[in-house]
Interface confidence: low
C-alpha cells in the first residue's frame, strides 16, 4: 500500500508538471504572439506613415510639376512676348524714323517750293513792273487806265503768291495727318478670343476725323494677351499712334503686324464717347490671349511635367533683346544725326 | 510487484508524454517564430522600399523646388528685362517723336523765314520801286494821287501774303501735331480688373478736336494687370519718357500703382459705337496670356504693385506687362492733355 501511494504521488506530480509545462508553453506562445503583434503594429504603422508621406510627397511633386510646367509656359510666353514686343517696338521706331525722313524731305520740298515760288513771283513782278513803268512813262497823257493797269499786276501777284502759299499750307498737313491715319488704319485688327461683334470695321483705328464723323469703337486686343493666344496679338496703338507713321508701306518689313504681340492683356475696348454703355470686362479665360494658358491657379494647371528640364532657355531672350536694342540704338543714332 | 510495475509503466508513459509535449511546444514556438520572422521581413522590406522611395521623392522635390525657384527668378528677370526694354524703347520712341516734332517746328520756322525773307525782298523792292516811280513821275510833272492809287496794292500785297503765310504756318503743324496726339489718344483701352464702366471720365484725356468729332471714350485701367510684379512695373518711364509727361504730379507714380490693377485677361470686347450693351469682362482663363494659366478672375487681376510678393505669381507675369503698358498709355494720355 505504501508503494502504491508513493507511485500515485509520483504520477500526480508528473501530471501537475505536465499542466505547468502546458500552461507555460501556452503563455510563451501568447507572449511571443503579443510581442510579434506589437512589433508588427509598429512596422505596419511605419509603412502606413511612409505611404502617407509618399502620397504627400507625390502630391507635392505633382503640384510642383504642374506649377513648374506652367512656369515654363510662362517663360516661353515671356520669350515670345518679348520677341514680339521688340519686333513691334523696332517696327514702330523704324516707322518713326522713316516718317522723320519723310517729314524732312517734305520740309525740304516745301522750302524749295516756297523759295522757287517766291523767286518766280519776284521775277514776274520785275517783268510786269518793267512793262508798267515803260507804259507809264510812255503814255502820261492817259493816267487813269495806266494806273489801273499798274495796279492790277500788283494785286494779282500777291494773290498768285497767296495761292501758292495757300497750297503749300493746305498740303502740308495733309500728308502729315494722313500719315497718322493711315498708320492707324494699318494696325491690324486683332481678334480676341471671344467672338467679336464689332469692328470688323475697316476704319477702326481712325485718328482725327472730319467733324461729325463717328469714330468706330475698337474691338481689338491690345496685344494679344500675351500669354495667350498665339495669334492674338495686336499693336499697341499707344506707340502706333505715337508714331503717326505713314503706313503707306504696308509691306513693312518684319513681323506682320499681326504678330506684334503686346503684353498680355491689354485688350482694348473703346467706345464712342456718346454712348454711356457700362462696358465692363471680366477676365475671361480666353481673355488671356495666351496659347495654352490658364493661370488659374494650381487648379487649372495641367502641365504636370515631371521633368525639371528648364528647356526654356530663358536667357536667350536676353540676347534677342540685346540684338533688338542694338538695332534700335543704331536707328536712333542715325535718327539723331538726321 | 505487479502493481509496482504497473505504476512504473504509467510513470514512464507520462514522462514520454512530457517529452512529446515539450518538443511539440518547442516546434510550435519555432514555427510561430519563423512565421513572424518571415512576416516581419516582408514588413521591414516594405518599410525600406518606402523609405527609399521617400528619399527619391524628397530629392526630386528638392531638385524641382530648386529649379522652380530658379525659374521664378528667370521670370522675375524677364519682367525686369521687359520693363527695362519697354522703358528703353519708349524712351527711344519718345526721342524720335520729339525729334520729329522738332524737325516739324524747325521746318515751319524755316519756311516762315524763307517766306518772310521773300516778302521782305518783295516789300523792299516795292518800296524802292515806288520811290523810283514817284521820282520818275514827279520829274514828268505827273499828279500825286495817281501814284498813290498805284502804290496801294503794293503795300497790300505783302500783308496779304503775310496773312496767307501766317495761316499756312499755324495751320500746318496743328493737324500734324494733333495727329500724333490724337493718335495717341487712340491708344487702346485697357481694362481694369474691375468692371469698368466705360467713360468714367469722358473728357479725361481729351485733346481739342474738330467740332463735331466724336471722341472715343477710353476706359483704361490705370495699370495693367501686371505681373503684379514685384515692383518692376510701376511706371514705365519708357512711355513716360515718350510722353514727355509732365511728372509734376509725382503722386501719380508710386502709390497709385497699387491701384493700377488690370484685369487679368483683359479681353477686349469692343462694340460698335452705336450699341449700348452693358458688356462686361471677366477675367477668364485665357485671360491669362499665359500658357497654362487662367486669369479669369478678380484674382487674376494684377495690380501693378511694387511690393507685394505677388512677384511670385508667375502666372501673372503677363499681367504685369499689361500693367506697364497701361501705365504707359495713361501717362501718355496725361502727357497729351498737358
Amino acid at each position: 500500500e505504501l508503494k502504491k501511494n508513493e507511485f500515485q504521488g509520483e504520477l500526480e506530480k508528473q501530471r501537475e508538471q505536465l499542466d505547468k509545462i502546458q500552461s507555460s508553453h501556452n503563455f510563451q506562445l501568447e507572449s511571443v504572439n503579443k510581442l510579434y503583434q506589437d512589433e508588427k503594429a509598429v512596422l505596419v504603422n511605419n509603412i502606413t506613415t511612409g505611404e502617407r508621406l509618399i502620397r504627400v510627397l507625390q502630391d507635392q511633386l505633382k503640384t510642383l510639376q504642374r506649377n513648374y510646367g506652367r512656369l515654363q509656359q510662362d517663360v516661353l510666353q515671356f520669350q515670345k512676348n518679348q520677341t514680339n514686343l521688340e519686333r513691334k517696338f523696332s517696327y514702330d521706331l523704324s516707322q518713326c524714323i522713316n516718317q522723320m525722313k519723310e517729314v524732312k524731305e517734305q520740309c525740304e520740298e516745301r522750302i524749295e517750293e516756297v523759295t522757287k515760288k517766291g523767286n518766280e513771283a519776284v521775277a514776274s513782278r520785275d517783268l510786269s513792273e518793267n512793262n508798267d513803268q515803260r507804259q507809264q512813262l510812255q503814255a502820261l497823257s492817259e493816267p487813269q487806265p495806266r494806273l489801273q493797269a499798274a495796279g492790277l499786276p500788283h494785286t494779282e501777284v500777291p494773290q498768285g503768291k497767296g495761292n501758292v502759299l495757300g497750297n503749300s499750307k493746305s498740303q502740308t498737313p495733309a500728308p502729315s495727318s494722313e500719315v497718322v491715319l493711315d498708320s492707324k488704319r494699318q494696325v491690324e485688327k486683332e481678334e480676341t478670343n471671344e467672338i467679336q461683334v464689332v469692328n470688323e470695321e475697316p476704319q477702326r483705328d481712325r485718328l482725327p476725323q472730319e467733324p461729325g464723323r463717328e469714330q468706330v469703337v475698337e474691338d481689338r486686343p491690345v496685344g494679344g494677351r500675351g500669354f495667350g493666344g498665339a495669334g492674338e496679338l495686336g499693336q499697341t496703338p499707344q506707340v502706333q499712334a505715337a508714331l503717326s507713321v505713314s503706313q503707306e508701306n504696308p509691306e513693312m518689313e518684319g513681323p506682320e503686324r499681326d504678330q506684334l504681340v503686346i503684353p498680355d492683356g491689354q485688350e482694348e475696348e473703346q467706345e464712342a464717347a456718346g454712348e454711356g454703355r457700362n462696358q465692363q470686362k471680366l477676365r475671361g479665360e480666353d481673355d488671356y490671349n495666351m496659347d495654352e494658358n490658364e493661370a488659374e491657379s494650381e487648379t487649372d494647371k495641367q502641365a504636370a511635367l515631371a521633368g525639371n528640364d528648364r528647356n526654356i532657355d530663358v536667357f536667350n531672350v536676353e540676347d534677342q533683346k540685346r540684338d533688338t536694342i542694338n538695332l534700335l540704338d543704331q536707328r536712333e543714332k542715325r535718327n539723331h544725326t538726321l | 510487484e505487479l502493481k509496482k510495475n504497473e505504476f512504473q509503466g504509467e510513470l514512464e508513459k507520462q514522462r514520454e508524454q512530457l517529452d512529446k509535449i515539450q518538443s511539440s511546444h518547442n516546434f510550435q514556438l519555432e514555427s510561430v517564430n519563423k512565421l513572424y520572422q518571415d512576416e516581419k521581413a516582408v514588413l521591414v522590406n516594405n518599410i525600406t522600399t518606402g523609405e527609399r522611395l521617400i528619399r527619391v521623392l524628397q530629392d526630386q522635390l528638392k531638385t524641382l523646388q530648386r529649379n522652380y525657384g530658379r525659374l521664378q527668378q528667370d521670370v522675375l528677370q524677364f519682367q525686369k528685362n521687359q520693363t527695362n526694354l519697354e522703358r528703353k524703347f519708349s524712351y527711344d520712341l519718345s526721342q524720335c517723336i520729339n525729334q520729329m516734332k522738332e524737325v516739324k517746328e524747325q521746318c515751319e520756322e524755316r519756311i516762315e523765314e524763307v517766306t518772310k525773307k521773300g516778302n521782305e525782298a518783295v516789300a523792299s523792292r516795292d518800296l524802292s520801286e515806288n520811290n523810283d516811280q514817284r521820282q520818275q513821275l514827279q520829274a514828268l510833272s505827273e499828279p500825286q494821287p495817281r501814284l498813290q492809287a498805284a502804290g496801294l496794292p503794293h503795300t497790300e500785297v505783302p500783308q496779304g501774303k503775310g496773312n496767307v503765310l501766317g495761316n499756312s504756318k499755324s495751320q500746318t503743324p496743328a493737324p500734324s501735331s494733333e495727329v500724333v496726339l490724337d493718335s495717341k489718344r487712340q491708344v487702346e483701352k485697357e481694362e481694369t480688373n474691375e468692371i469698368q464702366v466705360v467713360n468714367e471720365e469722358p473728357q479725361r484725356d481729351r485733346l481739342p478736336q474738330e467740332p463735331g468729332r466724336e471722341q472715343v471714350v477710353e476706359d483704361r485701367p490705370v495699370g495693367g494687370r501686371g505681373f503684379g510684379g514685384a515692383g518692376e512695373l510701376g511706371q514705365t518711364p519708357q512711355v513716360q519718357a515718350a510722353l514727355s509727361v509732365s511728372q509734376e504730379n509725382p503722386e501719380m507714380e508710386g502709390p497709385e500703382r497699387d491701384q493700377l490693377v488690370i484685369p487679368d485677361g483683359q479681353e477686349e470686347e469692343q462694340e460698335a459705337a452705336g450699341e449700348g450693351r452693358n458688356q462686361q469682362k471677366l477675367r477668364g482663363e485665357d485671360d491669362y496670356n499665359m500658357d497654362e494659366n487662367e486669369a479669369e478672375s478678380e484674382t487674376d487681376k494684377q495690380a501693378a504693385l511694387a511690393g507685394n510678393d505677388r512677384n511670385i505669381d508667375v502666372f501673372n507675369v503677363e499681367d504685369q506687362k499689361r500693367d506697364t503698358i497701361n501705365l504707359l498709355d495713361q501717362r501718355e494720355k496725361r502727357n497729351h492733355t498737358l
Epitope: T63, L282, S297 | S297
Partner: antibody, heavy 119, light 108 residues
Framework: EVQLVETGGGLVQPKGSLKLSCAAS????????MNWVRQAPGKGLEWVAR??????????FYADSVKDRFTISRDDSQSMLFLQMNNLKTEDTAMYYC??????????WGQGTTLTVSS | EIVLTQSPTTMPASPGEKVTFTCSAS???????LHWYQLKPGFSPKLLIY???NLASGVPARFSGGGSGTSYSLTIGTMEAEDVATYYC?????????FGAGTKLELK
C-alpha cells in the same frame, strides 16, 4: 452689368437627380471659366465644380464630395452653365451659386438657387 | 487638400474700431492664391480682396489684406455698421479650391 441667374433648384429625394442651370449675360461667357459653389444651411462656402473654356477643351474639376455624381457643362452659344446632379444625398442640400472666376478666385456670383434633398 | 483655418469664429466689434481676421493655411501657398469674400445675410458672396492684398472693384479702402506663406489676415481699418457680415478666406492654389469656415463680424 454682369448677371448670373441660377434656376432648377427644388426638393428632391435622396438618390434622385436634378439639373441646375445658370444664364449668364453682361460679359463674354465663352472666354470665362465657370464654377458652381454651394453653401449648406448654417455652414460655410464649398466649391463644387469648375469648367474651363473651349480653348482648354472644356476641362472640368470637381470637389471630392461630388466626384462621380455631379457633372458640370456649358453651352457657349446660349451663355449657359449647367450642373447635372445624380445620386443626390441629404448633405447636398444647399444654396448653389453660379460663379465666374479665374485663378482660383470667384469674381461674380449669381443670386443662387436652393436644392433640398430630403425624403 | 489645403485646409484654411479662420479665427476667431465670431468677432464682436463696434463701429469705428479696427478689426482683424486671420486665416491660416495647412500648407504654404503663394500669396497670389489667397482671397477674401464677404457674405452678408440675404446676399450672395462678394469678392472683397484678391491675391492677398488687392481690393476688388467697389470695395472701400478701409479694407486691406496681407500675409504670406501660411498666415494671412484681413483688416477693416475703421469698422462701419454695414460691414457686419461673415468673412471667408479662400485658396486657389490647388484643387479642391477651399474656403475657411468664416469669421462672423457682429456689432457689439
Amino acid at each position: 452689368e454682369v448677371q448670373l441667374v441660377e434656376t432648377g433648384g427644388g426638393l428632391v429625394q435622396p438618390k434622385g437627380s436634378l439639373k441646375l442651370s445658370c444664364a449668364a449675360s453682361g460679359f463674354t461667357f465663352n472666354t470665362n471659366a465657370m464654377n458652381w459653389v454651394r453653401q449648406a444651411p448654417g455652414k460655410g462656402l464649398e466649391w463644387v465644380a469648375r469648367i474651363r473654356t473651349k480653348r482648354y477643351n472644356y476641362t472640368t474639376f470637381y470637389a471630392d464630395s461630388v466626384k462621380d455624381r455631379f457633372t458640370i457643362s456649358r453651352d457657349d452659344s446660349q451663355s449657359m452653365l449647367f450642373l447635372q446632379m445624380n445620386n443626390l444625398k441629404t448633405e447636398d442640400t444647399a444654396m448653389y451659386y453660379c460663379v465666374t472666376g479665374g485663378t482660383g478666385t470667384f469674381d461674380y456670383w449669381g443670386q443662387g438657387t436652393t436644392l433640398t434633398v430630403s425624403s | 487638400e489645403i485646409v484654411l483655418t479662420q479665427s476667431p469664429t465670431t468677432m464682436p466689434a463696434s463701429p469705428g474700431e479696427k478689426v482683424t481676421f486671420t486665416c491660416s493655411a495647412s500648407s504654404g501657398i503663394s500669396s497670389n492664391y489667397l482671397h477674401w469674400y464677404q457674405l452678408k445675410p440675404g446676399f450672395s458672396p462678394k469678392l472683397l480682396i484678391y491675391r492677398t492684398s488687392n481690393l476688388a472693384s467697389g470695395v472701400p479702402a478701409r479694407f486691406s489684406g496681407g500675409g504670406s506663406g501660411t498666415s494671412y489676415s484681413l483688416t477693416i481699418g475703421t469698422m462701419e455698421a454695414e460691414d457686419v457680415a461673415t468673412y471667408y478666406c479662400q485658396q486657389g492654389f490647388s484643387i479642391p479650391l477651399t474656403f475657411g469656415a468664416g469669421t462672423k463680424l457682429e456689432l457689439k
